[in-house]
């Protein structure tokens, strides 16, 4: 960057090289060039010469003043007009940054995705800081009082093997950058309560000709958790509102859920699960599209395959659930 150039003088920023966005700042340039008494000192921002708000402080120093500086990053350098030199002489350069101190991290969440071998902790970092901001995740055993710290710039994956202090922990997040430091509230967790089952996936769908045509959705998960609660939501692609069905599920076999849908309509389905009675849900599965037929023939769809026809499918066991309407987005 600009900071690696050989300097014939000094450039500095007040109040600091990294400062709060919107502040008034002063950039000072001091020449120290052999046999050059600068007639003029010039400032450049991102390679463009500044023409205003420059004040000569003394024989070798000038100040450039900015009001309400809003750029997240800028490269500044200054030059001297030396008599008897045919071009400007570079004095020095500096990269400057503006941004914000971190907000207090909130919505700290730690989950263990089944089979991952990690505890994944995330949080809401708040507003964009624009500058390098680091996070320290503190994990303290409530049984041994031993505390571990993990440095990251976003979320953190902590190996469950490293969590040797029992099952109960306090977790909190400290955010810090050049402009400030904040700390979240403490989250109390029990490792058995934060496991999220292996992802549920919709594999295919079929519409069966009957007195009233019905659509069967086939879905499964590789989870070994015995008691799992799931939700399937669906809607016509033209609708805003989701319908939600709830299931108590045993994944020893492929799940089949039946729906009575309008003919000749394109629908979208998603599923998610949680360990029954626990706090955290899986994220909603990928969108699965299925178009119901106009009339008699059977139609089958597979994940990400739209409007696929198939007449030779039979129905195995059916799992039924309770129908609700849902306007919610994804919930963690």
């Amino acid at each position: 960057g600009i900071t690696n150039i050989n300097c014939s003088g000094h450039i500095w920023v007040e109040p600091a090289t990294i400062f709060k966005m919107g502040m008034n700042i002063s950039i000072y340039c001091q020449a120290a060039i052999k046999n050059c008494q600068p007639r003029k000192l010039h400032f450049y921002k991102n390679g463009i010469k500044e023409r205003f708000q420059i004040t000569r402080i003394n024989k070798t120093t000038a100040r450039l003043w900015y009001k309400n500086f809003l750029e997240p990053h800028a490269s500044m350098y200054c030059t001297a007009e030396c008599p008897k030199h045919f071009q400007e002489t570079l004095i020095c350069g500096k990269d400057i940054s503006s941004g914000y101190p971190p907000d207090i991290p909130d919505e700290v969440t730690c989950v263990i995705y089944e089979y991952s071998g990690n505890m994944t902790c995330t949080w809401n970092a708040g507003k964009l800081t624009y500058i390098d901001t680091k996070y320290v995740v503190h994990v303290k055993s409530l049984e041994t009082e031993e505390e571990q710290q993990y440095l990251t710039s976003s979320y953190i994956n902590i190996s469950t093997d490293s969590l040797q202090g029992g099952k109960k922990y306090l977790v909190w997040v400290q955010a810090a950058n050049a402009l400030g430091m904040e700390e979240s509230k403490q989250l109390q967790i029990h490792l058995d309560d934060i496991v999220i089952p292996s992802a549920a996936v919709i594999s295919r769908a079929e519409t069966i000709n009957a007195t009233v045509p019905k659509t069967i959705i086939y879905w499964d998960s590789q989870t070994t958790i015995e008691k799992v609660s799931c939700e399937m939501r669906y809607k016509a692609t033209t609708n805003q509102t989701w319908n939600v069905k709830e299931f108590d599920t045993n994944f020893t076999y492929v799940q089949q859920s039946e729906f009575y849908l309008e003919p000749n309509i394109k629908y979208v389905f998603q599923v998610r699960c949680q360990e029954t009675g626990k706090r955290y849900w899986q994220p909603w599965s990928s969108l699965f599209f299925h178009k119901t037929p106009e009339t008699v023939p059977q139609v089958t769809s597979k994940a990400f395959q739209h409007d696929t026809w198939n007449s030779g499918l039979t129905v195995a066991s059916i799992s039924t659930g309770h129908l609700t309407s849902d306007n919610r987005g994804d919930i963690g």
């Epitope: 120290a32 050059c36 008494q37 007639r39």
Partner: antibody, heavy 116, light 107 residues
């Protein structure tokens, strides 16, 4: 264009002090390094001191150290030479000059006569 | 301090002559050397800087050469206005020092 105008002839007794002024125009004093050079009657040029822009300080010739100061008044763009404890051998023409490395503009000179 | 030695001290020449003045430094200056012309009762006038660069407005009959410790001022064809005293000056280090001067007079 730089223009340097110096004060007029001064007559002093040995042991006295003298203040010679050098008024700058065309540029401000903040944009110029002023140096002082003297020339005794019939002799060569002798550098006395001036501002070194590389180190941001006034440097004096060893033989004048402690007997000369080079103050400046940036509000009036005037540089001064203060010479103390005058001796008869200080009789000379005193020049201010701008150092753009080298001295490219000179004042007209100020004659200082030290005589009892 | 760097000692600057000019030669000759006095030089008698005629209009149209080619005149050469030399200046020797007691240590290397790179190219930080200037030449001045001074007439009686006047301030010195810069002719050459950085050993060989001609100051703006100075006639091209003046030229400078050399580097390190040995430098030369040449007037290719002496004119009536050129009869004066010439000084070299080093501006490599402080204190700045001048040669003792070379007086060019009419033969």
């Amino acid at each position: 264009q730089v223009h340097l105008v110096q004060s007029g002839t001064e007559v002093r007794k040995p042991g006295a002090s003298v203040k010679v002024s050098c008024k700058v125009s065309g540029y401000t004093l903040n944009e110029l390094a002023i140096h002082w050079v003297r020339q005794a009657p019939g002799k060569g040029l002798e550098w006395m001191g001036g501002f070194d822009p590389e180190h941001g300080e006034i440097i004096y010739a060893q033989r004048f150290q402690g007997r000369v100061t080079l103050p400046e008044d940036t509000s009036t763009d005037t540089a001064y030479l203060d010479l103390f404890n005058l001796r008869s051998e200080d009789t000379a023409v005193y020049f201010c000059a701008t150092e753009a490395a080298p001295f490219d503009y000179w004042g007209q000179g100020t004659l200082v006569i030290v005589s009892s | 301090d760097i000692q600057m030695t000019q030669s000759p001290s006095t030089l008698s020449a005629s209009v149209g002559d080619r005149v050469t003045i030399t200046c020797r430094a007691s240590q290397s200056l790179s190219s930080w050397l200037a030449w001045y012309q001074q007439k009686p009762g006047k301030a010195p006038k810069l002719l050459i800087y950085k050993a060989s660069s001609l100051e703006s407005g100075v006639p091209s009959r003046f030229s400078g050469s050399g580097s390190g410790t040995d430098f030369t001022l040449t007037i290719s064809s002496l004119q009536p206005d050129d009869f004066a005293t010439y000084y070299c000056q080093q501006y490599d280090i402080y204190p700045r020092t001048f040669g003792q001067g070379t007086k060019v007079e009419i033969k």
